[in-house]
């Protein structure tokens, strides 16, 4: 399995964001695929649990992405990607994307760098 | 390194009330949300609730609703746990355990003795 | 809430050997998690997400499953993996752990 991400994302505080995923893959996409999506903060505190799907989505139950996560992607597609809502500066930090689709072999995780940021304010255009 | 440090094991009589603390350190105490599991003698595991460290929401096991309290002191990144009306069937160890990619990283766990 | 089965409840085995532990699901979840503890110590996490490593986890324990019936197998057990084992489900709440399986030295 190869993956591909947009490495870099740039997004406005109070937002949602498509964290982009996508994959290749010799073997055909059937319900052997799972993705699993995790994020690492920017403080370096411990990985946190974002999205799983196998067969159908799961959000998870408990933590700072429940209830504000959803899927985006189409299997059938090669696309893995998901919809983070409501963004926050705290979401600052490393988004990974892992895709295993038996019997092919794991690739390299693919990483998103999301960097959430202020509104622009009238007075700053105004400035540009 | 993340640490969490409950505080020490209590003997309580029927009726009576707990409240066990759970001390983070070595992490951002706020980004994740603090759980507690409670073990009695020999027996498995059952999830009691959890806290929100950011704005104290809850959600709890309804097995417990209307006698356990979770609260937590941002100040002093400590959360707690308090279980009243206890009975025997309440003698547990009780933990306190922060969800990550599962639940990660445990206290080191209270013993609660309910005895007359 | 849902109920989850392990079998066996107890497992003897020797070191070198191949361990497979069963949970059953009382209905569907989307996903397992498998926790290792010994006595007098808090559980440690071993599997998120039913096929995910926890970290420092090493690569003899794997999982697997879907639906009702998931997987915990260690491929050639180590001294130190004689321990109880717990799975739990985190589908929807309450989150809920299974009885345990005693993996002991045969």
């Known amino acids: 399995v190869e993956i591909y991400t947009s490495r870099v994302l740039e997004a406005v505080n109070g937002t949602d964001a498509r964290l982009k995923c996508t994959f290749s893959s010799f073997a055909p996409v059937g319900d052997a695929l799972t993705v699993t999506w995790n994020f690492r903060p920017l403080d370096g505190g411990p990985e946190q649990f974002v999205f799983y799907y196998h067969i159908d989505p799961f959000q998870p139950m408990s933590g700072r992405f429940k209830d504000r996560v959803s899927w985006d992607g189409n299997p059938e597609r090669y696309d893995a990607s998901i919809l983070l809502w409501k963004l926050q500066f705290d979401d600052n930090g490393t988004y990974t994307c892992q895709v295993k689709n038996p019997p092919d072999v794991d690739g390299v995780i693919g990483e998103i760098r999301l960097s959430v940021v202020h509104t622009v304010r009238f007075s700053e255009i105004h400035f540009l | 390194q993340v640490q969490l440090v409950q505080s020490g094991a209590e003997v309580k009589k029927p009726g009576a009330s707990v409240k066990v603390s759970c001390k983070a350190s070595g992490y951002t105490f706020t980004n994740y949300w603090m759980h507690w599991v409670r073990q009695a003698p020999g027996q498995g595991l059952e999830w009691m609730g959890e806290?929100?460290?950011?704005?104290?929401?809850?959600d709890y096991n309804e097995k417990f609703q209307g006698r356990v309290t979770m609260t937590v002191d941002k100040s002093t990144s400590t959360a707690y746990m308090e279980l009243s009306s206890l009975r025997s069937e309440d003698t547990a160890v009780y933990y306190c355990?922060?969800?990550?990619?599962?639940?990660?990283?445990w206290g080191q766990g209270t013993l609660v003795t309910v005895s007359s | 809430e849902i109920v989850l089965t392990q079998s066996p409840a107890t497992l003897s085995l020797s070191p070198g050997e191949r361990a497979t532990l069963s949970c059953r699901a009382s209905?569907?979840?989307?996903?397992m998690y498998w926790y290792q503890q010994k006595p007098g110590q808090a559980p440690r996490p071993l599997i998120y997400v039913t096929s995910n490593r926890a970290t420092g986890i090493p690569a003899r324990f794997s999982g697997s499953g879907s639906g009702t019936d998931y997987t915990l197998t260690i491929s050639s057990l180590e001294p130190e993996d004689f321990a109880v084992y717990y799975c739990q489900q985190w589908s929807s709440n309450p989150p809920t752990f299974g009885q345990g399986t005693k993996l002991e030295i045969k």
């Open positions: 355990t922060i969800y990550t990619t599962a639940l990660d990283y």
């Open positions: 806290i929100n460290p950011t704005n104290g929401g809850t």
């Open positions: 209905s569907s979840v989307g996903y």
